[in-house]
């Protein structure tokens, strides 16, 4: 059974925040640089487990506990490692960019688990 | 910087319920998510759950979903633990605490209330 | 749930030794694991987030190491000071679980 009781944050209350994040920023946490990940592997675990790494950065803090209570939900979520291109690194504003497309692609086609 | 202040010792009946305060200082109140924790005597730590202040949100550990609610009051920065149906199993130190610089690990705790419960 | 076994309740210690206290997760929690000090009578003091990156102020004789399952704080040159509860907590996953804690003693 899920973990967290409260309901997990909607596919739409992710978007919300990610565009919140986003708009009208050109860098977010100070430039910080994150391993760039592959997106259809598990889209909450693959995102959580690349901005997981970042610290001391207010501004996705709650991005980060939204894909995490996400993943949480997800069977055996904690196992499943995703795909990391170990050998690129994006900003953190354009792995939250990245996410937020795929995110309204899901969100377009009714794909939301 | 970043204060904690708890509400003190508390000595309830069983039956009872008991509403433990945590008043912050030195940053803003709404930027970061308030947990609550509880120690049994001489036991390991419990994760309770968390409230956002900015949204009111709230996550529980699904151990406590029926014995806790989390609350906050933004115009005096303090936030509120409920717990209720109390019996001894309940007796514990409860601390609140807030993660600042790493996402979910508190590193500025309240000094903690102890909630003995006995009739 | 992700349960955290610290295999070792106590550890006994001299002052000036190196000791290792391990943390083992039930899955992989990557490098989400964070460490924390206890006094008696006193609310914990984190040390380490992200398995090995120290919190401002933490002297440098404490580190932590690992990923994955396994995770080990190791204190270097023990102190009297250092004599405390030691707890690991994952925070990969809700809901964020503690190790029931090593109390490191002295010999």
């Known amino acids: 059974s899920p973990s967290p009781v409260t309901p997990s944050p909607t596919l739409k209350e992710l978007i919300e925040e990610l565009v919140n994040i986003t708009q009208n920023q050109a860098s977010l946490c100070n430039g910080s640089m994150v391993w760039s990940v592959n997106l259809t592997a598990g889209m909450y675990c693959a995102a959580l487990e690349s901005l997981i790494n970042v610290s001391d950065c207010s501004a996705i803090q709650r991005t980060q506990r939204m894909l995490k209570a996400l993943c949480s939900q997800k069977p055996a979520a904690g196992q499943i490692s995703s795909e990391r291109s170990r050998d690129t690194k994006i900003e953190v504003i354009q792995l939250v960019k990245n996410l937020l497309t795929y995110v309204r692609g899901v969100y377009r086609h009714g794909n939301f688990r | 910087e970043v204060q904690l202040q708890q509400s003190g010792p508390e000595l309830v009946k069983p039956g009872a319920s008991v509403k433990v305060s945590c008043k912050t200082s030195?940053?803003?109140?709404?930027?970061?998510?308030i947990y609550w924790v509880r120690q049994s005597h001489g036991e390991s730590l419990e994760w309770i759950g968390y409230i956002d202040p900015y949204n009111g949100g709230t996550t529980y550990n699904q151990n406590f979903k029926d014995k806790a609610t989390l609350t906050v009051d933004k115009s005096s920065s303090t936030a509120f633990m409920h717990l209720n149906s109390l019996t001894s199993e309940d007796s514990a130190v409860y601390f609140c605490a807030t993660a600042v610089v790493a996402t979910d690990v508190m590193e500025n705790w309240g000094q903690g209330t102890s909630v003995t419960v006995s009739s | 749930d992700i349960v955290l076994t610290q295999s070792q309740k106590f550890m006994s210690t001299s002052v000036g030794d190196r000791v290792s206290i391990t943390c083992k997760a039930s899955q992989n929690v990557r490098n989400a694991v964070a460490w924390f000090q206890q006094k008696p009578g006193q609310s914990p003091k984190a040390l380490i987030y992200l398995a090995s990156n120290r919190y401002t102020g933490v002297p440098d004789h404490f580190t932590g190491s690992g990923s994955g399952t396994d995770f080990t704080l190791t204190i270097s040159n023990v102190q009297s000071e250092d004599l405390a509860d030691y707890f690991c907590?994952?925070?990969?996953?809700?809901?964020?679980?503690f190790g029931a804690g090593t109390k490191l003693e002295l010999k």
């Open positions: 907590l994952q925070h990969w996953n809700y809901p964020l679980t």
């Open positions: 030195g940053y803003s109140f709404t930027d970061y998510p």
